[in-house]
Interface confidence: low
Amino acid sequence: MAVTACQGLGFVVSLIGIAGIIAATCMDQWSTQDLYNNPVTAVFNYQGLWRSCVRESSGFTECRGYFTLLGLPAMLQAVRALMIVGIVLGAIGLLVSIFALKCIRIGSMEDSAKANMTLTSGIMFIVSGLCAIAGVSVFANMLVTNFWMSTANMYTGMGGMVQTVQTRYTFGAALFVGWVAGGLTLIGGVMMCIACRGLAPEETNYKAVSYHASGHSVAYKPGGFKASTGFGSNTKNKKIYDGGARTEDEVQSYPSKHDYV
């Protein structure tokens, strides 16, 4: 019972985590403009992995996708890759773990097979969570570095007058979503691995016993009758992620193309 609960909870926690990773990857608020000491009339800028947005105080917002791959910073590409790998591994892990769940019977699947699948999905969740945490952390590190660089004093040639750059970028909501989601996926993965130990049949429990009767050699292995619950496996290909850089035509429409420049 405890094993089933641990496995089920691990699955649910991982499911929430992976949903969070997908959400974080698609979110625009990876970095947001630090509004401290900002001029009243400054526009508010925030950026995601796939597009950059500018918002005016009235709420008018316009977002543009990054339409180039070559011109993007290597770090941004690395973060994208980590998040996508995290999503893909997590999605595969979810698929595997559905079949591994103790409460679901598919055909005459052995407990050992379920244990292996549980372990596989657990490892996938752990790696998925680590990818997400790594991706978010790399981006956060980039921001911290740039944040302090942008607040450094810049001296102009005339009379040593000091200027400070006013606009700085700070952590956006997506980073926190990513960290929490990555952590949840990691925890879910660990729980699945723990559940796997309880699922694996102990080899010393039963030994194959041979009964000799009326000249016939009948090998009997305990295992009993396995009843199928009749649950159909819904393995339709659901579109899990569509975070690729959008084309110009795919950019969402706004009240007017003239609302903002």
Epitope: P39, V40, N45, V54, E56, R64, T167
Partner: antibody, heavy 119, light 110 residues
Framework: QVQLVQSGAEVKKPGSSVKVSCKAS????????ISWVRQAPGQGLEWMGG????????NYAQKFQGRVTITADESTSTAYMELSSLRSEDTAVYYC????????????WGQGTLVTVSS | QSVLTQPPSASGTPGQRVTISCSGS????????VNWYQQLPGTAPKLLIY???QRPSGVPDRFSGSKSGTSASLAISGLQSEDEADYYC???????????FGGGTKLTVL
């Protein structure tokens, strides 16, 4: 403090074109809209168009559509305004200004560039 | 011909209160916020009032703005000699899809 420094005065012949630059310092260039506003001698202010460097797309006043091109170079934090097919009535001081375009709010202005169109 | 209409000139004595009007239409002032600029002789314009009545930091509270319907006004109380300048109103115009300015008002401090 944000500063917008414009290129020097220009004297041009009718029919030619002029390109005025506006270099920004002391702020994040890409995120802010840069507008171009002109002022003919003894006349009022006239908005020509503007650009958000991070997007690269410009918006122009109907009057100047087809004759003005506004661009921005993020690497040098510089915005440019090119006006072609110059006429004598284009003699004016051209200002670059930073701020909201959608609301006509410009918080920082360049010092202005006098463009004289004369044969 | 400017889209926003301002009186060409206004005058007052030091310490006096002066009001400059700006008249527009439903497509500009009627549906958008109004901003005011001060242009001292030989210098670039400076933002004086934004969003009808907001003052950027550094602008004295002697300057105030208001809007009613399709008209706006700039009030300067306790007039000073350094207030002698050209004043422009500006707003976004939904019909033209761009920023429109008033013709400007030359304020003379007598």
């Amino acid at each position: 403090q944000v500063q917008l420094v414009q290129s020097g005065a220009e004297v041009k012949k009718p029919g030619s074109s002029v390109k005025v630059s506006c270099k920004a310092s002391g702020g994040t260039f890409s995120s802010y809209a840069i507008s171009w506003v002109r002022q003919a001698p003894g006349q009022g202010l006239e908005w020509m168009g503007g650009i958000i460097p991070i997007f690269g797309t410009a918006n122009y006043a109907q009057k100047f559509q087809g004759r003005v091109t506004i661009t921005a170079d993020e690497s040098t934090s510089t915005a440019y305004m090119e006006l072609s097919s110059l006429r004598s009535e284009d003699t004016a001081v051209y200002y670059c200004a930073r701020g909201f375009i959608r609301y006509g709010v410009f918080d920082y202005w360049g010092q202005g560039t006098l463009v004289t169109v004369s044969s | 011909q400017s889209v926003l209409t301002q009186p060409p000139s206004a005058s007052g004595t030091p310490g006096q209160r002066v009001t400059i009007s700006c008249s527009g239409s439903s497509s500009n002032i009627g549906s958008n916020t109004v901003n005011w600029y001060q242009q001292l002789p030989g210098t670039a314009p400076k933002l004086l009032i934004y969003s009808n009545n907001q003052r950027p930091s550094g602008v004295p509270d002697r300057f105030s703005g208001s809007k009613s319907g399709t008209s706006a006004s700039l009030a300067i109380s306790g007039l000073q000699s350094e207030d002698e300048a050209d004043y422009y109103c500006a707003a976004w115009d939904d019909r033209f899809h761009h920023v429109v300015f008033g013709g400007g008002t030359k304020l003379t401090v007598l």
